[in-house]
C-alpha cells in the first residue's frame, strides 16, 4: 500500500516536473527588461531559448526567431541542450513508469521487472530535474554577469553624454517555473527509486527449505514457484494480480497548473 | 470611423479649475490608450498623460503631476482630463489623441483640440 | 527627459523642390531587440490637430502620400519631401516614441516662396 501510494505520488509529481520543463523550455520570458532604476521605456523587451519579443505600450507584441545557429552564444546552446535532453529523459522515463506502476497491470509482469523499471525511471527523473536546474542555473548565471556588465557599462559615457542606454534583463517568470519544474521532477525521481526498493521481492524470505509431507515431497528453491498450487506460495506478491479495482492502489492524478506570465 | 470630439473652449480664472472632455467612437475605447497633448500658441507639443480606459491605469509627465487628473468613462466612451490650479502659462490648446496599436508607441488620431485661456 | 532637436526650424522652399529636415535626439530611440527606431513625425497644419506621417521613423501611415520618405536611425533622423506640394505647408514634429516622457521637437515650419 504505502510502496504503490509511493510510487504513485512520485509518477504524478515528475509529471507536474516534466510538463513544467516543457513548458519553461517553450516559454518566451527567459530573461525580461529590468524595469528599476532604469529609463522607463515605452517597449517592454523579454527573450526566451528560442526568440526575442518586444511589447509596446498599446500592448502590440512582435517576435523574432533566433534564426541563427552558429551566431548564438555557446552557453545559449548548452541551455538548449540541458533542457531538451531533460525533456528526452524524462519522457522516456514517464513511459517507462507507467508500465512499472504497481497499480496497472500488464501480462504476468514479475515485480522483479516492475521494481528494474521503477529504478531506471526514476534515475531517468533525478536526471532530468538535474538536467533542467542545470540549465536554468546556468541561464541565470549568464544573466547576472550581462547585468552588472552592462550596468557598469551605463554608467560610462563619452564626454559626459550617454547616447545609448543599455537595455538591462533580469530573471523571466521562466527561470522560477524551470527551477521549482526541475526540482518536483527530481523529488518524483528520488520517490521512484524509493519506491523501487518496497517493489522488489526480498529472496531472504525464502530459503532452500525442503518440507516433509506426508504422500510427497516438495523441493523449494529459493523464490519460490510462481505457478505453484498455492502452499507457501508469495502472496505478497500475488495481491498484484487480483484485477479488482482498489481504492487504496489508485493513483490520484493532480492536474498540471503553472502560470504563464 | 474613428473619431475623437473635444469640448468647446474654455476661459477660466488663475487658479480655478476646469476639466476637459473627449468624447470617441468608432473603436473600443477601452482596448487603446488616450494621450492629453498640451500646444502653447505658437510653440511646440508637449505630453501631459495617457490613460488606459479598460483598466484606468495613467502615466503621467512628471512636470505635469498635481496639474492635470485623468478619468475616464467607460459607458460614455469619454476621456476627461482635469486641469487644476491653473496659471497663465496653463494657457493652451490641448488635444487629445488616440494610441495606435502597433504602430510604434504613436497617436494615429487626433481630436480637434480644446483651447483654454487663463485670464482674469 | 529625452531632448529632441529639429534643424532647421524654418524652410521657405518653392513647388516641385526636394525638401529634407531634421531630427536629433539626446539619445538613441533604436530598441536593439526588434531593430526598430521609435520616432515619430507628424505633420500639423494651421488651426489642425497634428496628422501623423511615420513611425518607427521609416513605417508610412497609411495614407500618406509617397513624396514622403522617414529615415535615419539611432540619435540622427530625416524626413524628406521629394518634390514639395502647396497642401505640404505645415509645421512638421518629431516625436520620442521610446522613453517617457515622451517629447517632441520645437517643429519645422515649412513655408512657400
Known amino acids: 500500500m504505502a510502496v504503490t501510494a509511493c510510487q504513485g505520488l512520485g509518477f504524478v509529481v515528475s509529471l507536474i516536473g516534466i510538463a513544467g520543463i516543457i513548458a519553461a523550455t517553450c516559454m518566451d520570458q527567459w530573461s525580461t527588461q529590468d524595469l528599476y532604476n532604469n529609463p522607463v521605456t515605452a517597449v517592454f523587451n523579454y527573450q526566451g531559448l528560442w526568440r526575442s519579443c518586444v511589447r509596446e505600450s498599446s500592448g502590440f507584441t512582435e517576435c523574432r526567431g533566433y534564426f541563427t545557429l552558429l551566431g548564438l552564444p555557446a552557453m545559449l546552446q548548452a541551455v538548449r541542450a540541458l533542457m531538451i535532453v531533460g525533456i528526452v529523459l524524462g519522457a522516456i522515463g514517464l513511459l517507462v513508469s507507467i508500465f512499472a506502476l504497481k497499480c496497472i497491470r500488464i501480462g504476468s509482469m514479475e515485480d522483479s521487472a516492475k521494481a528494474n523499471m521503477t529504478l531506471t525511471s526514476g534515475i531517468m527523473f533525478i536526471v532530468s530535474g538535474l538536467c533542467a536546474i542545470a540549465g536554468v542555473s546556468v541561464f541565470a548565471n549568464m544573466l547576472v554577469t550581462n547585468f552588472w556588465m552592462s550596468t557598469a557599462n551605463m554608467y560610462t559615457g563619452m564626454g559626459g553624454m550617454v547616447q545609448t542606454v543599455q537595455t538591462r534583463y533580469t530573471f523571466g517568470a521562466a527561470l522560477f517555473v524551470g527551477w521549482v519544474a526541475g526540482g518536483l521532477t527530481l523529488i518524483g525521481g528520488v520517490m521512484m527509486c524509493i519506491a523501487c526498493r518496497g517493489l522488489a521481492p526480498e529472496e531472504t524470505n525464502y530459503k532452500a527449505v525442503s518440507y516433509h509431507a506426508s504422500g510427497h515431497s516438495v523441493a523449494y528453491k529459493p523464490g519460490g514457484f510462481k505457478a505453484s498450487t498455492g502452499f507457501g506460495s508469495n502472496t505478497k506478491n500475488k495481491k498484484i494480480y487480483d484485477g479488482g479495482a482498489r481504492t487504496e492502489d489508485e493513483v490520484q492524478s493532480y492536474p498540471s497548473k503553472h502560470d504563464y506570465v | 470611423q474613428v473619431q475623437l470630439k473635444q469640448s468647446g473652449p474654455e476661459l477660466v480664472r488663475p487658479g480655478a479649475s476646469v476639466k476637459l472632455s473627449c468624447k470617441t467612437s468608432?473603436?473600443?475605447?477601452?482596448?487603446?490608450?488616450i494621450h492629453w497633448v498640451k500646444q502653447r500658441s505658437g510653440q511646440g507639443l508637449e505630453w501631459v498623460v495617457r490613460?488606459?480606459?479598460?483598466?484606468?491605469?495613467?502615466y503621467y509627465n512628471e512636470k505635469f503631476t498635481g496639474k492635470a487628473t485623468l478619468t475616464a468613462d467607460k459607458s460614455s466612451s469619454t476621456a476627461y482630463m482635469q486641469l487644476s490650479s491653473l496659471k497663465y502659462e496653463d494657457s493652451a490648446v490641448y488635444f487629445c489623441?488616440?494610441?495606435?496599436?502597433?504602430?510604434?508607441?504613436?497617436?494615429?488620431?487626433w481630436g480637434q483640440g480644446t483651447s483654454v485661456t487663463v485670464s482674469s | 527627459d529625452i531632448v529632441m532637436t529639429q534643424s532647421p526650424s524654418s524652410l521657405t522652399v518653392t513647388a516641385g523642390e526636394k525638401v529634407t529636415m531634421n531630427c536629433k535626439s539626446s539619445?538613441?530611440?533604436?530598441?536593439?531587440?526588434?531593430?526598430?527606431?521609435?520616432l515619430t513625425w507628424y505633420q500639423q497644419k494651421p488651426g489642425q490637430p497634428p496628422k501623423l506621417l511615420f513611425y518607427?521613423?521609416?513605417t508610412r501611415e497609411s495614407g500618406v502620400p509617397d513624396r514622403f520618405t522617414g529615415s535615419g536611425s539611432g540619435t540622427d533622423f530625416t524626413l524628406t519631401i521629394s518634390s514639395v506640394q502647396a497642401e505640404d505647408l505645415a509645421v512638421y514634429h518629431c516625436?520620442?516614441?521610446?522613453?517617457?516622457?515622451?517629447?517632441f521637437g520645437g517643429g519645422t515650419k515649412l513655408e512657400m516662396k
Open positions: 490613460i488606459y480606459p479598460g483598466t484606468g491605469n495613467t
Open positions: 468608432g473603436y473600443i475605447f477601452t482596448n487603446y490608450w
Open positions: 518607427w521613423a521609416s
Open positions: 539619445q538613441s530611440l533604436l530598441n536593439s531587440a526588434n531593430q526598430k527606431n521609435y
Open positions: 489623441s488616440r494610441e495606435g496599436y502597433g504602430k510604434g508607441n504613436s497617436m494615429d488620431y
Open positions: 516625436q520620442n516614441a521610446y522613453y517617457y516622457p515622451y517629447t
